[in-house]
C-alpha cells in the first residue's frame, strides 16, 4: 500500500512582473489526516504562502474549488508578481498533531523565476559645464530588472560610444538587479545641439529597448570670442564702438563697457542671434563723446559669461589734431588696442 | 454505491470486550479517513475516533481502551472495545469521511449501525 | 473543545411552513459546519457542509448559512419526509469533532 506522495510537477515557473504565478501541486490520498500548506523556501525561516484554514493571504487563489469535495489539488495562484516573489515554492502535507500538526510529506518544491522589465535608464551629467576639448562622464541607471543578463550601449549623436564602463549588482542570487554604467564623452564646440543616449536592452523587452537621454547643451559651456570694432563717425564728436560676441552658450551672458578703467555701461544679453550649431552671438554698442575727452581714449568690452572670469578686448582711441583712416580692430586676442585718431 | 456494515456488535458485560468491524465498497477505501460515531439510546451523536493511514484520534472518553485500526487489502475498518462500560452503550456507525476545502473533515456516507450494550 | 448549541430543541411544524433551525459555537469556526438529518431507526444523513455547500441529491429546499460563530439551516417549504432531529457538527478544531444536542422537527 502506498503513502501519500505531494506532487509538484513544475521544478521551476518563470512568470513576468506583474502576472499571476500558478503553482501547482497534488495529493495521491486524502490521509493521513492534516493539511496542505504551501511555503517559500526551506527550513526553520521558510515564510508561509497559504495555509486555507487561518491567516490573510490576499494575493493567493486556490486553484480548486474550495467548496468540492475531497479535493486533492492544492495547486495555488498568486497574483500581481514581483521580483521579490523569486524563490522555491513547497507544497506542504502535514499530519493533524495535538496541539501542532506536524510536517508529513513535502513536494519537491517548484522555483519561481520572475522576469521583470528594467525601469527607464536615467541619465545624469556632470554637475558643472565643460567647456569644448574636456572629457565628461555620463552615468546611465536603470533598476528592478530579472533575470540578470542586460545589454547596455552608449550613443552619442547616434554614434556608438566605446569609453564606457558598466557594472551590474548584485553580483550574486538576488531578486532583482541594477545596472549602472558611465561614458567618457568628449565634448566638441558642435555639441550644443548634441544627445547622449544610453540604451538598455533585456529580454522582457522584446526587442524594443528602452532609452534614456541627456542634452549636451545642459553640459557644455562655449566660451565666447569678442571682436571690438570702431564704426563710422555719427557726428563731428561721437564715434560709434561695437563689441561682437560671438559663438557663445549659454546665453547667461553679461557685458560692461569700461572707459579708461571706469564703467561706463553693464547690460544683459537679451535680443540675441541663435547659430545652426546651438550658440549664440550678441553685440553691443557704445556712443563714446570724443569732445568729452583731452586724452587718448581706452574702451573696453568686458564680458563675464556664465559666471566664468570676465574676457575682454579693448579699443583705444587717440584723440588727434589730424584725420587718419578709419578701421577696425580684429585681433583674436582676449586682449589688445588698435589706435585710431579721431577729429 | 458507497456502502458502509457494521457487525460485531452484542451484548457485553461491564469490563468486558468487543471487536466491531465495517465492511466499506464503492469508493476508494485505502485513500479515506474512516470513523466511528456513536449514538446511546435516545441521545444525540458523539464522536469515537478516526484513523487516517496509521494517523489514529480518539475522544477522550475512549481513549486508552478502544483502537481503531483499519485493513486496507480487505477494505475493512475495526474498533476494538475493551474495558467496556455501561455508558458505552450505544449504536456505533461507521462513518466514511469526507473534506472539503484543503482540510477539515466531516462525514458524508453512514453505516446502518450496530449497537452495543454493556450491562450486567 | 467547540461546544455546539442548537435550538430550539423542538419544533413543532406543518408541512409547507418555513423552517429555521439554529446552531451556535462556543468559538470561531469559521464555515466549517455541517448539518445532517436523522429519521428515527435510521443513520444520520449528509445534508449541508461548508455551512451553505448542500450534498448531492439534497433537494433544494435545504440552504445553511452562517459563518463565526452563528450558523442556520432553513428549510423553506417543509415536506412530510423532512421530519426528524436534525444535528449540526464542526470540524474546524478536533480532536473532537463535536455535534449540537439536535433539534427534533415534529408534526404540529
Known amino acids: 500500500e502506498e503513502e501519500l506522495q505531494v506532487i509538484q510537477p513544475d521544478k521551476s515557473v518563470l512568470v513576468a512582473a506583474g502576472e499571476t504565478a500558478t503553482l501547482r501541486c497534488t495529493a495521491t490520498s486524502l490521509i493521513p489526516v492534516g493539511p496542505i500548506q504551501w511555503f517559500r523556501g526551506a527550513g526553520p525561516g521558510r515564510e508561509l504562502i497559504y495555509n486555507q484554514k487561518e491567516g490573510h493571504f490576499p494575493r493567493v487563489t486556490t486553484v480548486s474549488d474550495l467548496t468540492k469535495r475531497n479535493n486533492m489539488d492544492f495547486s495555488i495562484r498568486i497574483g500581481n508578481i514581483t521580483p521579490a516573489d523569486a524563490g522555491t515554492y513547497y507544497c506542504v502535507k502535514f499530519r493533524k498533531g495535538s496541539p501542532d500538526d506536524v510536517e508529513f510529506k513535502s513536494g519537491a518544491g517548484t522555483e519561481l523565476s520572475v522576469r521583470a522589465k528594467p525601469s527607464a535608464p536615467v541619465v545624469s551629467g556632470p554637475a558643472a559645464r565643460a567647456t569644448p576639448q574636456h572629457t565628461v562622464s555620463f552615468t546611465c541607471e536603470s533598476h528592478g530588472f530579472s533575470p540578470r543578463d542586460i545589454t547596455l550601449k552608449w550613443f552619442k549623436n547616434g554614434n556608438e560610444l566605446s569609453d564606457f564602463q558598466t557594472n551590474v549588482d548584485p553580483v550574486g542570487e538576488s531578486v532583482s538587479y541594477s545596472i549602472h554604467s558611465t561614458a567618457k564623452v568628449v565634448l566638441t564646440r558642435e555639441d550644443v545641439h548634441s544627445q547622449v543616449i544610453c540604451e538598455v536592452a533585456h529580454v522582457t523587452l522584446q526587442g524594443d529597448p528602452l532609452r534614456g537621454t541627456a542634452n549636451l547643451s545642459e553640459t557644455i559651456r562655449v566660451p565666447p570670442t569678442l571682436e571690438v570694432t570702431q564704426q563710422p563717425v555719427r557726428a563731428e564728436n561721437q564715434v560709434n564702438v561695437t563689441c561682437q560676441v560671438r559663438k557663445f552658450y549659454p546665453q547667461r551672458l553679461q557685458l560692461t563697457w569700461l572707459e579708461n578703467g571706469n564703467v561706463s555701461r553693464t547690460e544683459t544679453a537679451s535680443t540675441v542671434t541663435e547659430n545652426k550649431d546651438g550658440t549664440y552671438n550678441w553685440m553691443s554698442w557704445l556712443l563714446v563723446n570724443v569732445s568729452a575727452h583731452r586724452d587718448d581714449v581706452k574702451l573696453t568690452c568686458q564680458v563675464e559669461h556664465d559666471g566664468q572670469p570676465a574676457v575682454s578686448k579693448s579699443h583705444d582711441l587717440k584723440v588727434s589734431a589730424h584725420p587718419k583712416e578709419q578701421g577696425s580692430n580684429t585681433a583674436a586676442e582676449n586682449t589688445g588696442s588698435n589706435e585710431r585718431n579721431i577729429y | 454505491e458507497v456502502q458502509l456494515v457494521e457487525s460485531g456488535g452484542g451484548v457485553v458485560q461491564p469490563g468486558g470486550s468487543l471487536r466491531l468491524s465495517c465492511a466499506a465498497s464503492?469508493?476508494?477505501?485505502?485513500?479515506?479517513?474512516v470513523s466511528w460515531v456513536r449514538q446511546a439510546p435516545g441521545k444525540g451523536l458523539e464522536w469515537v475516533s478516526t484513523i487516517g493511514a496509521d494517523d489514529t484520534y480518539y475522544a477522550d472518553s475512549v481513549k486508552g481502551r478502544f483502537t481503531i485500526s483499519r485493513d486496507n487489502s480487505k477494505n475493512t475498518l475495526y474498533l476494538q472495545m475493551n474495558s467496556l462500560r455501561a455508558e458505552d452503550t450505544a449504536v456505533y456507525y461507521c462513518?466514511?469521511?469526507?473534506?472539503?476545502?484543503?482540510?477539515?473533515?466531516?462525514?458524508?456516507?453512514w453505516g446502518q449501525g450496530t449497537l452495543v450494550t454493556v450491562s450486567s | 473543545e467547540i461546544v455546539l448549541t442548537q435550538s430550539p430543541a423542538t419544533l413543532s411544524v406543518s408541512p409547507g411552513e418555513r423552517v429555521t433551525l439554529s446552531c451556535r459555537a462556543s468559538q470561531n469556526v469559521r464555515s466549517d459546519i455541517a448539518w445532517y438529518q436523522q429519521k428515527p431507526g435510521q443513520a444520520p444523513r449528509l445534508l449541508i457542509y461548508?455551512?451553505?455547500s448542500r450534498d448531492t441529491g439534497i433537494p433544494a429546499r435545504f440552504s445553511g448559512s452562517g459563518s463565526g460563530t452563528d450558523f442556520t439551516l432553513t428549510i423553506s417549504s417543509l415536506q412530510s419526509e423532512d421530519f426528524g432531529v436534525y444535528y449540526c457538527q464542526q470540524y474546524y478544531d478536533w480532536p473532537p469533532f463535536t455535534f449540537g444536542g439536535g433539534t427534533k422537527v415534529e408534526i404540529k
Open positions: 461548508a455551512a451553505s
Open positions: 462513518a466514511k469521511d469526507s473534506t472539503v476545502g484543503w482540510s477539515g473533515d466531516f462525514f458524508d456516507y
Open positions: 464503492g469508493f476508494s477505501f485505502s485513500i479515506y479517513a
